[in-house]
């Protein structure tokens, strides 16, 4: 029975040129975590697992940094990295749970972040 | 070349007991999560246990909980399954799997070694 | 647990053809299924997972689709090779749980 929740950072906007923080949050389950897939589309960015610890995709390492925690931070932003983002939350006994945030990369110096939001 | 080759498979009586191995080669054994999935002789797949790769995490479906124990030993690049208190509906064909990295399915399979219960 | 029905448990088909095979869950796996083929004296291969991406390695004739409780994998202008045992699999939660198996024979 999957009864948790991920909440996420929503909808987020940043500079060209500066970094942004991805954060997932699982809560109301027992569940164990295993592993959280960072993703991009269907791109695998990171991974980090709790018996091996972080990942990086080689084609992502001059520009992903693992965390804080279980988040994901993105540096030298271009606008090419406007799009959707997943934290993918492999757990047991519960299974797989995925949260989604849009990030808008801008030009202008002037970069609000969305509000949080929840999926179930 | 990913390989995976099962073998410690045999007849044994029901209430007895059996250990399987599974010596990987050509990757980072400990790196992935590994898999035993067993095919009856009706041909239905089940999956049976999983190990982490640093060995810290196992599991286990209900119908093998208490008598089933995965384990693995990194150094030797090797996965075990430990049976013990054998049933007739444990006969099957058993094989090892290599789960993807990204934890989405099991890309390599070995070829599998048979396990009988009967008296 | 997740029950998978797969259908049909048998298919004859000719070389050149294209089949569906289909795959329902008894609740919804969001997009996380796989597809294996088995073959006598060949391990078995993963050709697809994530319900549509596609394994490294395996030809672009192989394809799925689906998400939620319905799945289909689809082979395209079928090879010689093709013919074989074929399996899905949901990895969305445990117990990872597979459905009957299909049998692609040659007509």
């Known amino acids: 029975m999957m009864t948790g929740t991920i909440e996420t950072t929503g909808n987020i906007s940043a500079e060209k040129g500066g970094s942004i923080i991805l954060q997932c949050h699982l809560s109301s389950t027992t569940a164990q975590v295993t592993q959280v897939n960072w993703e991009q589309q269907d791109q695998l960015l990171a991974i980090c697992n709790a018996d091996l610890g972080w990942h990086i995709s080689p084609s992502f390492k001059d520009r992903v940094a693992p965390g804080p925690g279980l988040g994901l931070t993105l540096q030298s932003l271009t606008v090419n990295d406007t799009g959707e983002y997943f934290c993918i939350y492999h757990t047991y006994p519960d299974g797989t749970y995925t949260g989604r945030i849009f990030l808008e990369v801008l030009e202008s110096s002037v970069a609000e972040h969305g509000a949080r939001f929840q999926i179930p | 070349e990913v390989q995976l080759v099962e073998s410690g498979g045999g007849l044994v009586k029901p209430g007895g007991s059996l250990k399987l191995s599974c010596a990987a080669s050509g990757f980072t054994f400990s790196n992935y999560a590994m898999s035993w999935v067993r095919q009856s002789p009706e041909k239905r797949l089940e999956w049976v246990a999983e190990i982490s790769g640093g060995g810290s995490y196992t599991y286990h479906p209900d119908t093998v909980t208490g008598r089933f124990t995965i384990s693995r030993d990194n150094a030797k690049n090797t996965l075990y399954l430990e049976m013990s208190s054998l049933r007739s509906e444990d006969t099957a064909m058993y094989y090892c799997?290599?789960?993807?990295?990204?934890?989405?399915?099991?890309?390599?399979w070995g070829q599998g070694t048979s396990v009988t219960v009967s008296s | 647990d997740v029950q998978i029905t797969q259908s049909p448990s048998y298919l004859a088909a000719s070389p050149g053809e294209t089949i569906t095979i289909n795959c329902r869950a008894s609740?919804?796996?969001?997009?996380?299924l796989a597809w294996y083929q088995e073959k006598p004296g060949k391990t078995n291969k993963l050709l697809i997972y994530s319900g549509s991406t596609l394994q490294s390695g395996i030809p672009s004739r192989f394809s799925g689709s689906g998400s939620g409780t319905d799945f289909t994998l689809t082979i395209s202008s079928l090879e010689p090779e093709d013919f074989a045992m074929y399996y899905c699999?949901?990895?969305?939660?445990?117990?990872?749980?597979f459905g009957g198996g299909t049998k692609l024979e040659i007509k």
């Open positions: 799997a290599r789960k993807r990295r990204d934890y989405y399915a099991m890309d390599y």
């Open positions: 699999q949901q990895h969305n939660e445990y117990p990872w749980t």
């Open positions: 609740k919804s796996i969001s997009k996380y």
